[in-house]
């Protein structure tokens, strides 16, 4: 039950996170005009990954797309790439995790397969979240650098007669949306990985049972070889001579493939 809840919660948190990453990527307010020096500007500038906008005090808003690809800063291209990779990984992760959900039955899919898929989607969510956080952080760093550079040479002009003021930009709403969304996706991914441990089928152990076939006195002991699904501790199919009888403590003490999570 706890496993299902963890998996379900991980899925929902990741879903919200990825929706947030998509929203942040599409938002125009990655950077907004710093109004510290001029709070009564008649035009307010803000920029996104795909276009820059100006909102006049009348409410009229005009946006212009970045129609060039080669003329854009490499950092902006990198941020775009990171966000898109994050979205793609997240989307694939969501698709995989839907089929991995314990509450959804698809044919005769085994728990081991669901565990594998849960782990895969979890890792995808983690990488997706990291991509988003990295992208937003790179952009934020770029903003901070440009902010102080434009502050240093704020006024240039002819003999101080004409002021050509460089527009300074500060953090926009999209950055905070991106950070939170990336964090949620990351958390969701971790939860999926934790859920994966619980989904991994425990070793099914049987007590030794004697089957007497008619005419032959042969004792058959099942569990001589453990079924190797890749999730058990015995991956080399070593012969078990104790008939599979173990205490509960012993079973849990064996290291699992997923104990690092």
């Amino acid at each position: 039950m706890a496993v299902t809840a963890c998996q379900g919660l991980g899925f929902v948190v990741s879903l919200i996170g990825i929706a947030g990453i998509i929203a942040a990527t599409c938002m125009d307010q990655w950077s907004t005009q710093d109004l510290y020096n001029n709070p009564v500007t008649a035009v307010f500038n803000y920029q996104g990954l795909w276009r820059s906008c100006v909102r006049e005090s009348s409410g009229f808003t005009e946006c212009r797309g970045y129609f060039t690809l080669l003329g854009l800063p490499a950092m902006l291209q990198a941020v775009r790439a990171l966000m898109i990779v994050g979205i793609v990984l997240g989307a694939i992760g969501l698709l995989v995790s839907i089929f991995a959900l314990k509450c959804i039955r698809i044919g005769s899919m085994e728990d081991s397969a669901k565990a594998n898929m849960t782990l895969t989607s979890g890792i995808m969510f983690i990488v997706s979240g990291l991509c988003a956080i990295a992208g937003v952080s790179v952009f934020a760093n770029m903003l901070v650098t440009n902010f102080w550079m434009s502050t240093a040479n704020m006024y240039t002009g002819m003999g101080g007669m004409v002021q050509t003021v460089q527009t300074r930009y500060t953090f926009g709403a999209a950055l905070f949306v991106g950070w939170v969304a990336g964090g949620l996706t990351l958390i969701g991914g971790v939860m999926m990985c934790i859920a994966c441990r619980g989904l991994a089928p425990e070793e099914t152990n049987y007590k030794a049972v004697s089957y007497h076939a008619s005419g032959h006195s042969v004792a058959y002991k099942p569990g001589g070889f453990k079924a190797s699904t890749g999730f058990g501790s015995n991956t080399k199919n070593k012969k078990i001579y104790d008939g599979g009888a173990r205490t509960e403590d012993e079973v849990q003490s064996y290291p699992s493939k997923h104990d690092y999570v």
Partner: antibody, heavy 119, light 112 residues
């Protein structure tokens, strides 16, 4: 067609208050901002204040303490109040339309109302 | 506040000729989005001002294409080709980048 009509007293005594009304027709105040601009006799234009379609206001900082603007969308009227009048407030007062949905600024002006501040 | 300077108080012109009226701002009106927030108005004698040019170079509706605006971030020119008697009046430039909105002192167009 688009019309803006300013109305108010012709003569006001110094230190008194002035109330001006801008009545508009041919458009709605829910889609346009209204500026007040004045022109002292034989001089240039001076911007006073603006009230936007959503009710936001911006004042000329030099006159902010003496100005107050409000509007009634249903009556299609904008009211400008100015207190502590001085003789240098003598001017023609214009109300001006500003679209909220396009790049044009101050695209239609009223005919103006002349206000004289004198004892 | 941004100061708008119209150096020439009046400009005499012969009907049918072209004339240029200049305006200068104390600060660049070129915004980072590429728009220049400079406007031109004409106030004919005894009338209210009317919008001629918005955002430095765009013609307002109903304004003949004899009028054109140009300039850099701080220096602007209103050009009138084939001047007519109806063009007489005071031409004002205005900045709308920052509050308070400010106007130039005006340049009077007079016929020779």
């Amino acid at each position: 067609q688009v019309q803006l009509k300013e109305s108010g007293p012709d003569l006001v005594a110094p230190s008194q208050s002035l109330s001006l009304t801008c009545s508009v027709s041919g458009f709605s105040l829910t889609s346009y901002g209204i500026h007040w601009v004045r022109q002292p006799p034989g001089k240039g234009l001076e911007w006073l204040v603006v009230i936007w379609s959503d009710g936001r206001t911006t004042y000329n900082s030099g006159l902010k303490s003496r100005l107050s603007i409000s509007k009634d969308n249903s009556k299609s009227q904008v009211l400008l109040k100015m207190n502590s009048l001085r003789t240098d407030d003598t001017a023609i007062y214009y109300c001006v339309r500003h679209p909220a949905f396009g790049p044009h600024a101050m695209d239609y002006w009223g005919q103006g109302t002349s206000v004289t501040v004198s004892s | 506040d941004i100061v708008m300077t119209q150096a020439a108080p009046s400009v005499p012109v012969t009907p049918g000729e072209s004339v240029s009226i200049s305006c200068r701002s104390s600060k660049s009106l070129l915004n980072s989005n590429g728009n220049t927030y400079l406007y031109w108005f004409l106030q004919r004698p005894g009338q209210s001002p009317q919008l001629l040019i918005y955002r430095m170079s765009n013609l307002a509706s109903g304004v003949p294409d004899r009028f054109s605006g140009s300039g850099s971030g701080t220096d602007f020119t209103l050009r009138i080709s084939r001047v007519e008697a109806g063009d007489v009046g005071v031409y004002y430039c205005m900045q709308y980048l920052e509050y308070p909105v400010t106007f130039g002192a005006g340049t009077k167009l007079e016929l020779k």
